[in-house]
């Protein structure tokens, strides 16, 4: 506990001190005081450098004195024989004696008192930057006018901080400019402009004079500019050493002017202004900027338009242009958007055709559609080649974006029919010879496939069963084979309006207009065993002449059995209608004269007993197309006959082409593309 005064006596004082003693006293007076230590008696064994016995006075790490021997006062009015004055509030006194004393020594008596120190003058380092004021037990610092005492209560500085500049243009100078700036000051100025403007600082070299750097290059006084995480400076010296125009790229700038205690100069003056934040003219590939400028600044808006074949994809939506705004941070809005090549996507598949998987589906890519040859061909032309257009569609030169249509090739059997022997008198056939042949199982009859959705047959086949079950693609009509073939399901039966419906069909003598169409529920898939027959053209080329040959096929009665198990066929010549009239009806249901013969009927047969018979009805009388010898067309349909194995009558299909086309058009369902 600090005290203001005290007494220190050697051991056994005033008796002789003992040998081999070491004793210390720690003196402490209150802070702000020094210590005056004085000895009134001193009697210690004398030795060189007081090596044997001694009293030692230590202040901190410094030995203030070491005493031995005998002393007496020089002043008769004062008992003090030795004294010490220290400006510190702590002192240590150490007494030591060795192992022997030649005489009897009495030691020492000493006193200490706390004394005031003058902090303003007693120390090498001046405690105050400006004015120092001493008082008993301490001191205080004070400042000249316009200066203020810092929080450390020692340093004075000018009050030059806290100014915030928000105007878009302004001037800032060091305190007292152009008079010397204050020493020992830290001046902070803040420029805060609206977002989107950058602070640009301009200085003139002659407007800058700040205490120069030391030998190590460190500025003693310094001017520093801080913009976000960027710093310009520190700057010092005579004449501004930095760039005379500083673009900070920020709307906020802190200016810090730091001075030390010495070397004041005139200082500095600067101007600043707010520049709209520039945005870089970016190179955005495959696009055009509108408007085009050399420089873009805050709030500028550009429309970036993609070149043809390129698009902006944002989410799932594709656009050809977008707007970008120069933002307050010097960056463009929508900068992530890019003009990418238009992607036409995976091309749509087409019925009965294919498109090879494209290597690329981007703008300019080319794809080719093909039909499943030889059963389908491209109806609407265009060659099947499409390119990815700028609008994101696959486009064909002829069809535009319309997809190609693969339609069945008609009238071309995969294998030609060859008569192996002498239907009645006919030959075994394969369904590949007559891929258009349709089998009706109730009643047992035939028909001809004319396209994906339509079957042509005789009216008398379907008049009693408007929901016939049909089969295609099988040579044999055994149940086991039909189970593995394609069954066709009817949607609607259209009987020619000229066909007379009878209450007792068995007694029919008039087979005029014996023609009907069956619309199918589902399209038929074509292949080697299923493929349509062509319809006759309307030109005179398709008028039949006597002797013209045609092919008939079916599973009707043969010489051997009532129903053929495997398809039979025969080649027959067209004959004059009178030949059919002349044949006696085998099992007449009326007078021979009652049977009607019209120009809507073709008479054919009469050669080698080859003829159609019961169960062949509705099948095609197929004739080679006069304009394309590779194809067959349905010139007739098996209708009726006076007697199997003689001549037969066939519905003349050419006379019904208009009705067929009209019926199909009026009852077609739009293709589900």
């Amino acid at each position: 506990e600090p005290t203001m005064y005290g007494e220190i006596l050697s051991p056994n004082y005033p008796q002789a001190y003992p040998s081999e003693v070491e004793k210390s006293w720690d003196i402490e007076v209150p802070e702000g005081y020094g210590i005056h230590l004085y000895f009134t008696h001193l009697d210690i064994e004398l030795s060189e450098n007081c090596a044997y016995d001694s009293v030692q006075i230590i202040s901190g790490d410094t030995e203030e004195g070491r005493l031995c021997g005998q002393r007496s006062s020089n002043n008769p009015h004062s008992p003090i024989v030795e004294e010490f004055q220290v400006p510190y509030n702590k002192l240590q006194v150490i007494f030591k004696s060795d192992f022997s004393n030649e005489e009897r020594f009495t030691g020492f008596a000493a006193y200490y008192v706390a004394t005031d120190i003058n902090e303003c003058t007693d120390f090498v380092d001046v405690p105050c930057s400006h004015f120092c004021n001493n008082f008993i037990g301490g001191y205080f610092c004070s400042c000249p006018p316009e200066y203020f005492l810092h929080d450390d209560m020692k340093n004075c500085g000018v009050n030059c901080s806290g100014d915030v500049f928000t105007a878009l243009i302004g001037e800032i100078a060091s305190p007292n400019y152009p008079k010397p700036y204050p020493e020992n000051s830290r001046c902070e100025y803040q420029i805060r402009l609206e977002k989107g403007f950058q602070v640009v600082v301009t200085l003139r070299r002659e407007d800058f004079d700040v205490e120069a750097a030391d030998s190590a290059g460190n500025c003693l006084d310094s001017l520093v500019f801080v913009a976000g995480d960027r710093q310009f400076g520190p700057y010092c010296g005579h004449g501004f050493p930095g760039p005379l125009n500083i673009e900070t790229k920020s709307n906020a700038l802190d200016i810090i002017f730091q001075t030390d205690l010495t070397g004041q100069k005139k200082g500095w003056k600067l101007r600043y202004h707010g520049d709209p934040m520039p945005c870089p003219k970016e190179d955005t590939p495959n696009s055009v900027w509108e408007p085009a400028k050399a420089k873009y600044v805050f709030r500028d808006v550009v429309q970036i338009t993609c070149l043809d074949g390129f698009e902006v994809v944002e989410g799932r939506v594709g656009a050809t242009s977008f707007y970008s705004t120069c933002q307050s941070n010097g960056k463009w809005s929508n900068s992530k958007l890019k003009c990418q090549p238009v992607d036409c996507g995976i091309p749509e598949s087409i019925e009965n055709g294919k498109v090879e998987d494209p290597e690329s589906t981007l703008f300019g890519s080319v794809i080719r559609y093909t039909c499943e040859e030889p059963y389908y061909y491209m109806e609407n032309g265009g060659g099947g080649e499409y390119h990815c257009a700028g609008n994101g569609s696959w486009v064909n030169e002829v069809l535009g974006p319309e997809l190609p249509k693969c339609v069945p090739v008609c009238g071309v059997p995969r294998e030609p029919f060859e008569e192996k022997q002498r239907i009645i008198g006919g030959s075994d056939a394969d369904i590949k010879n007559f891929p258009w042949q349709v089998f009706f199982d109730n009643p047992w009859a035939g028909g001809a496939l004319i396209n994906e959705y339509w079957v042509l047959t005789a009216a008398h086949v379907v008049e009693g069963n408007r929901e016939p079950t049909m089969y295609v693609g099988s040579t044999s009509v055994q149940t086991s084979r039909l189970a593995k073939s394609k069954m066709l399901t009817p949607e609607h039966v259209f009987i020619h309006p000229g066909w007379k419906l009878l209450e007792v069909p068995e007694g029919r003598t008039n087979f005029d207009n014996d023609i009907a169409l069956v619309r199918l529920k589902d399209p038929v898939k074509m292949g080697p065993t299923v493929s349509p027959i062509c319809l006759p053209g309307t030109s005179s080329d398709y008028n039949l002449m006597d002797g013209d040959l045609g092919l008939i096929s079916g599973w009707g009665r043969t010489e051997k059995r009532d129903r053929a198990v495997r398809l039979k066929a025969a080649r027959l010549p067209v004959a004059p209608l009178r030949k059919c009239k002349e044949v006696k009806v085998e099992k007449p249901t009326a007078d021979a004269e009652a049977y009607v013969f019209t120009p809507n009927m073709i008479c054919a047969g009469g050669e080698k007993g080859m003829d159609s018979c019961k169960g062949d009805s509705g099948g095609a009388f197929a004739v080679q197309d006069p304009n394309d010898k590779t194809k067959f067309y349905a010139a007739g349909l098996v209708s009726w006959g006076p007697q199997c194995g003689t001549y037969g009558l066939y519905t003349r299909v050419k006379n019904y082409v208009d009705w067929i086309m009209k019926t199909m058009q009026e009852n077609s369902t739009p293709r589900e593309d």
């Epitope: 199982d441 109730n442 055994q478 149940t479 084979r481 009532d562 129903r563």
Partner: antibody, heavy 125, light 107 residues
Framework: EVQLVESGGGVVRPGGSLRLSCAAS????????MSWVRQAPGKGLEWVSG????????GYADSVKGRFTISRDNAKNSLYLQMNSLRAEDTALYYC??????????????????WGKGTTVTVSS | DIQMTQSPSSLSASVGDRVTITCRAS??????LGWYQQKPGKAPKRLIY???NLQSGVPSRFSGSGSGTEFTLTISSLQPEDFATYYC?????????FGGGTKVEIK
């Protein structure tokens, strides 16, 4: 040439079982239905059972229903008749015969156009 | 079940005779009827199918007719090899039924 050869006949006690087989050749077996017909000594023909081309449809005479089972293995071109709970009145010459079925939805049957020579089954204690 | 009644059960005839055998169905069977010939110790052989259709390879002296419930097998001129037992078979529905048979013997 169409050939049907029956086997598996023999003597069996009442209540016993037998399995008859019919091996087919000379035609596409799985295109045809098949029938079993029997003839008791000195008696007329009696249809026993029939099966369609793929085995999905079968029929039986009232006299054997619940005791006999007809089946076929198209891979082996074979027809079978499993006879259980045999009775004395089942004693007969058993024939297998070929049946033709035409049409896909509306059927036309042509039964028993070819026959085997038969196999004899005797049920006796 | 449909029952088939065949008559006569037997008949005697001479070579060259015209022979007629009748089969009657207990209910209408359209034309789903066949005729079979069986000789002693042999398997039956089909002569006629679908009431009137002659089996391939069968002589044309054999013919069938009828529809519904009444059916006839006719041998226009009996030949020595025709002496046998004849059966009708209905196959309009399961269970199939044979007639009782007609034995044609030499007079």
């Amino acid at each position: 040439e169409v050939q049907l050869v029956e086997s598996g006949g023999g003597v069996v006690r009442p209540g016993g079982s037998l399995r008859l087989s019919c091996a087919a050749s000379g035609f596409t077996f799985d295109d045809y239905g098949m029938s079993w017909v029997r003839q008791a000594p000195g008696k007329g023909l009696e249809w026993v059972s029939g099966i369609n081309w793929e085995g999905g449809s079968t029929g039986y005479a009232d006299s054997v229903k619940g005791r006999f089972t007809i089946s076929r293995d198209n891979a082996k071109n074979s027809l079978y008749l499993q006879m259980n709970s045999l009775r004395a009145e089942d004693t007969a010459l058993y024939y297998c015969a070929r049946d033709e079925q035409l049409g896909g939805n509306h059927y036309y049957y042509y039964y028993m156009d070819a026959w085997g020579k038969g196999t004899t089954v005797t049920v006796s204690s | 079940d449909i029952q088939m009644t065949q008559s006569p059960s037997s008949l005697s005839a001479s070579v060259g005779d015209r022979v007629t055998i009748t089969c009657r169905a207990s209910q209408g069977i359209r034309n789903d009827l066949g005729w079979y010939q069986q000789k002693p110790g042999k398997a039956p052989k089909r002569l006629i199918y679908t009431a009137s259709n002659l089996q391939s390879g069968v002589p044309s002296r054999f013919s069938g007719s009828g529809s519904g419930t009444e059916f006839t097998l006719t041998i226009s001129s009996l030949q020595p090899e025709d002496f046998a037992t004849y059966y009708c078979l209905q196959y309009a529905s399961y269970p199939l039924k044979f007639g009782g048979g007609t034995k044609v013997e030499i007079k």
